[in-house]
């Protein structure tokens, strides 16, 4: 039986239950190196409290479909008086990037993942020509995800004294210059996330191999190589190379640009201090608000709700978008499904569209982006589910008594982006991370 | 690739103001950093500002800082801007470019350049 989702076969994947303190291991298509779950373990549970370890998926018991993977074990499980086996349900969702295994929730038998990845998607579009994992747990089994710095068109440029050179590079996955307006950055050859442009000539200096390591609590690498053999003449005879470390910077700031620390003989070391390499929940609520010890700062996106039927409405072009944020409440015109954000096409009103659902709801505030986004829309030709990402802006003197009101600044590849000036993205800082 | 039209230049005394517009067609609008550049005649093209795609960010020159404001209106597929309180040095070909490359201000690094639009400054 082919593997179902070769992309995701080269790597080991992590998933925690920080709940429970478990740590899961996942290879999809072959067996996890750990002897404790035995030779044949496609799921290994790790119980950190205990320090034992179980494989709650075989392997060789695999069954899948395009949206889901199973692996049974033939260890008895009792739900309700039956005897079942215990088992692990992945669901696959498309998503723009290779992702992340998500835990869910575990029953007495069955163990749910949900894993949103270009490798389910039913279009190669967001397929790269080479992507590694991009996140890792750290020690007290805290998520850094750096997904979200991954460009799925275009580079970064690293800040670097030197007149004659541009170092580009992305996050974890090759650079696309499909897109590319006619710049430098279009002689990039295929496959390269780290390119080095030389006037009108430019080099891969640097491919993704390995997933993102953590090597402190605070600090993140990523390797790049030069897989093709064949020595670049200005590189002394040594093979070019690239190492990203990522910081978390030890209080919230904006935003800062990759810089280029080290380099000799093409051997680029590269440091880029970013919030992204703090720990998720630092980052992030799946409420309106963000506050506390842990976040560092006071954020309050509540009062934009809409209360009584009433929507904030923002013109794209051939559409409208109804928007109810950080509440619970029915667009009317969205046919009870469930959306924060409603796409309706004006020259056909019944053509509606849920463009995320506030039950997937994401609130981030990150390298001084305030940004409230929503999953889980409708369906796209791509098998990509809509959604909606919402940038804020802090606007003391925003109209609708301080609200604002969101304004429609683009779509991509079903991704519909607004921004917004609000009173309420003001945010206030505590100082002791 | 992405077709750029500038407009809006012309001569203005210093002090004044003026309003330039940059109407793009062609590929996706969306997925562009957009830039305003300058060149005065006998100097190298500069940097004066830039918006990001997805967030409506902005980045300035210094020497533009608190004069100059750009902004877009994805609606018409445009790109502007707004030069108030000129000086005589801002008189150049002023330019709009895209780029998919994040955290630059080099003009190397944009593509799809226009024609251009002439800015005189004078009395």
């Known amino acids: 039986q082919a593997a179902p989702f070769p992309e995701l076969c080269s790597y080991t994947w992590e998933a925690v239950d920080t709940k429970n303190n478990v740590l899961y291991k996942i290879n999809i298509c072959g067996s996890v190196d750990i002897v404790q779950c035995g030779p044949s373990s496609a799921v290994c549970m790790h119980l950190l409290k205990t320090r034992t370890y179980h494989s709650v998926g075989d392997s060789v018991l695999r069954s899948a479909t395009r949206s889901l993977l199973e692996f049974n074990t033939t260890v008895s499980c009792d739900q309700q008086g039956t005897n079942h086996r215990v088992q692990s349900s992945i669901a696959f969702l498309c998503g723009k990037t290779l992702g992340t295994p998500e835990f869910v929730t575990a029953t007495e038998c069955v163990h749910y993942f949900e894993w949103r990845t270009t490798a389910a998607c039913k279009k190669d579009i967001f397929k790269a020509n080479k992507e590694v994992p991009c996140y890792v747990f750290d020690e007290e089994l805290r998520k850094h995800d750096l997904n979200p710095l991954i460009k799925l068109s275009g580079a970064y440029l690293v800040d670097d004294s030197d007149p004659d050179t541009s170092l580009f590079i992305n996050v974890c996955r090759d650079i696309d210059t499909l897109r590319d307006p006619g710049s430098q950055l279009r002689a990039c050859p295929p496959g390269t996330a780290a390119c080095l442009v030389r006037g009108h000539q430019a080099f891969d200096v640097g491919q993704p191999r390995d997933g993102l390591k953590v090597v402190r609590k605070d600090r993140l690498v990523l390797s790049y190589v030069r897989e093709e053999a064949g020595k670049l003449d200005f590189c002394d005879g040594h093979s070019p190379a690239v190492t990203i470390t990522f910081v978390c910077p030890s209080e919230r700031r904006e935003g800062t640009i990759p810089k280029l620390t080290a380099k000799s003989n093409c051997r680029y070391e590269i440091e880029w201090i970013t919030e992204y390499a703090c720990h998720r929940d630092y980052l992030e609520s799946k409420t309106c608000s963000l506050s506390g010890e842990q976040q560092d700062v006071s954020i309050d996106l509540t009062p934009l709700a809409q209360s009584g039927g009433s929507s904030y409405i923002s013109d794209g072009k051939e559409y409208l978008f109804y928007l109810n944020v950080c509440g619970e409440t029915e667009i009317q015109f969205c046919n009870k499904k469930q959306a924060a954000v409603c796409q309706v096409k004006k020259s056909d009103t019944s053509q509606v569209k849920a463009a995320g659902r506030y039950h997937n709801q994401t609130l981030r505030y990150s390298d001084g982006d305030l940004t409230l986004i929503y999953f889980g829309g409708d369906e796209c030709s791509s098998g990509f589910q809509r959604m909606s990402v919402i940038n804020f802006e802090c606007n003391k003197t925003a109209g609708n008594d301080g609200k604002g009101t969101p304004v429609f600044t683009g779509e991509v590849d079903c991704t519909y982006f607004f921004t917004w000036d609000t009173e309420y993205a003001c945010v206030h800082h505590h100082h002791h991370h | 690739d992405v077709q750029l039209v500038e407009s809006g230049g012309g001569l203005v005394q210093p002090g004044g103001s003026l309003r330039l517009s940059c109407a793009a067609s062609?590929?996706?609008?969306?997925?562009?950093?957009w830039g305003w550049f300058r060149q005065a005649p006998g100097k190298e093209r500069e940097f004066v500002a830039a918006i990001r795609w997805s967030s409506s960010k902005t980045s300035y020159a210094d020497s533009v800082k608190g004069r100059f404001t750009i902004s877009r209106d994805n609606a018409k597929n445009t790109i502007y801007l707004q030069m108030n309180s000129l000086r005589p040095e801002d008189t150049a070909v002023y330019y709009c470019?895209?780029?998919?490359?994040?955290?630059?201000?080099?003009?190397?690094?944009?593509?799809?350049w226009g024609q251009g639009t002439l800015v005189t400054v004078s009395s």
């Open positions: 470019a895209a780029s998919i490359v994040d955290f630059t201000t080099n003009p190397s690094h944009f593509g799809s």
């Open positions: 062609g590929r996706t609008f969306n997925t562009y950093n």
